[in-house]
């Protein structure tokens, strides 16, 4: 990813994902330089004329910024001297996906690195006991996903069991007509067991766990971005 050698500095980027409608971060670090006024940061996007963002002489320079990024970007200005060139992106859109280049010039030299930015929607699932059902069942809901994910159930007691025959999953388009609400119901659940609802697309994987006993219900959920890292 980075370029090193005489007059070149190491620049490191991290593949990351943006959740549409929220803030996103394009991560980039470089060899620090205490001379802030000598640091130039340029962010470019493949297929876009003009810059995504430019920071030089200690401040933002938007004179060459492409219109689609106007008012939507900022570097973490107080962290530039310690080698952070990451870019904050406002209101992530599907069209923000693509290949970006982080280009750095300092008094020590110059370097650049590319990153792949994926965009979609992902959210934490919540599992509840569905008391409306005729038999004991669990309802797993996650408000925003895109592209359409796969949903699978697992259980601690019946490891390796296929729950597709005893579950029903639906995808409901949200009001903005892009993201979807995921609802999956698992039927015929047994007490004193831990069940997991796993939702996954090519951007993220989310898991919700629920343990139902006679006396209590314990829940836990986690979200993991896929393929993120250097």
């Amino acid at each position: 990813f980075g370029i090193s050698g005489k007059h070149f500095i190491t620049v490191t980027t991290f593949t990351s994902a943006g959740n549409i409608g929220e803030d996103g971060t394009l991560s980039c670090t470089f060899e620090p330089d205490i001379k802030l006024n000598g640091i130039v940061i340029q962010w470019l996007k493949e297929g876009i004329k003009g810059l995504v963002h430019e920071f030089k002489e200690g401040k933002d320079d938007l004179s060459q910024q492409h219109e689609m990024f106007r008012g939507r970007t900022a570097v973490f200005a107080d962290q530039v001297v310690v080698g952070n060139a990451s870019l904050r992106l406002k209101n992530v859109q599907l069209t923000d996906a693509g290949t970006y280049t982080c280009y750095i010039r300092t008094s020590k030299g110059k370097g650049n690195a590319n990153l792949e930015y994926k965009t979609g929607a992902f959210s934490m699932p919540e599992i509840n006991v569905d008391y409306n059902a005729s038999s004991e069942s669990l309802r797993c809901e996650a408000p925003r996903w895109f592209p359409q994910p796969t949903v699978a159930w697992a259980s601690q007691v019946d490891q390796g069991a296929n729950f597709s025959e005893v579950s029903n999953t639906s995808f409901e388009l949200n009001s903005e007509n892009v993201t979807m609400k995921v609802v999956s119901v698992l039927y015929n659940v047994t007490i004193n067991n831990t069940y997991s609802c796993m939702i996954e697309n090519d951007i993220a994987k989310a898991t919700g766990d629920i343990k139902v006993t006679d006396s209590e219900v314990k829940r836990r959920s986690q979200l993991q971005l896929l393929n993120s890292g250097p």
Partner: antibody
């Protein structure tokens, strides 16, 4: 600390223009967007538009295009809004505010005290 | 253009109580909703941005939540100085939009 000092109240004739100012201090003027809003009693706030003093870039609410003109003078760290062809509907308090997040257009985090404009013959 | 419909337009609540104000966006989905307090003769004060992030120095009695098109703002343990007009701001799009405001009276 961040401060925005707006010009004083004005009584103006219908059909004329008025130019109000918003002087910024306590931060780098060219690095943050400045937004303008209109407040009429019983009507709440209306977004007029905003300007990035570092490059003169502007965004306008369609409703105020041709009515409001936003400018900025970097040397005096002052933003201006000119309102033209005034009618009684333009009688209101006008606020300027800094948008949080530097070149990223964030929420209006620091406001001026407002400029009251009364249009009357 | 996005419109923000705020409700109620006014409400009265007791000292120590709790109130909730809502704003509904006409379209779109993003977390860029801020809440302000405005008292007569003063400039508006930013309380919450990005749906639920409290501004520095704002007490935890104030809170915000929401997603999609529906956003809410709450004040608990109401104090006399909470008497004011509160309004929301949608700032995710090119054109920002304000809610109509809610006048809160403390009894």
């Amino acid at each position: 600390q961040v401060q925005l000092q707006q010009s004083g109240a004005e009584l103006v004739r219908p059909g004329t223009s008025v130019k109000m100012s918003c002087k910024a201090s306590g931060y780098t003027f060219t690095s943050y967007w400045i937004g303008w809003a209109k407040q009429r009693p019983g009507h709440g706030f209306e977004w007029i538009g905003d300007i990035y003093p570092g490059g003169g870039y502007t965004n306008y609410n369609e409703k105020f295009k041709g009515k409001a003109t936003l400018t900025a003078d970097k040397s005096s760290s002052t933003a201006y809004m000119q309102f033209s062809s005034l009618t009684s509907e333009d009688s209101a308090i006008y606020y300027c505010a800094r948008l949080d997040g530097s070149s990223y257009r964030g929420a209006m985090d620091s406001w001026g005290q407002g400029t009251s404009i009364t249009v009357s013959s | 253009d996005i419109q923000m419909t705020q409700s109620p337009s006014s409400l009265s609540a007791s000292l120590g109580g709790k109130v909730t104000i809502t704003c509904k966006a006409s379209q779109g989905f993003n977390k860029y909703v801020a809440w302000y307090q405005h008292k007569p003769g003063q400039c508006p004060r930013l309380l919450i941005h990005y749906t639920s992030t409290l501004q520095p120095g704002i007490p935890a009695r104030f809170s915000g939540s929401g997603s999609g098109r529906d956003y809410s703002f709450s004040i608990s343990n109401l104090e006399p100085e909470d008497s004011a007009t509160y309004f929301c701001l949608q700032y995710g799009n090119l054109l920002y939009a304000f809610g109509g405001g809610t006048k809160l009276e403390i009894k």
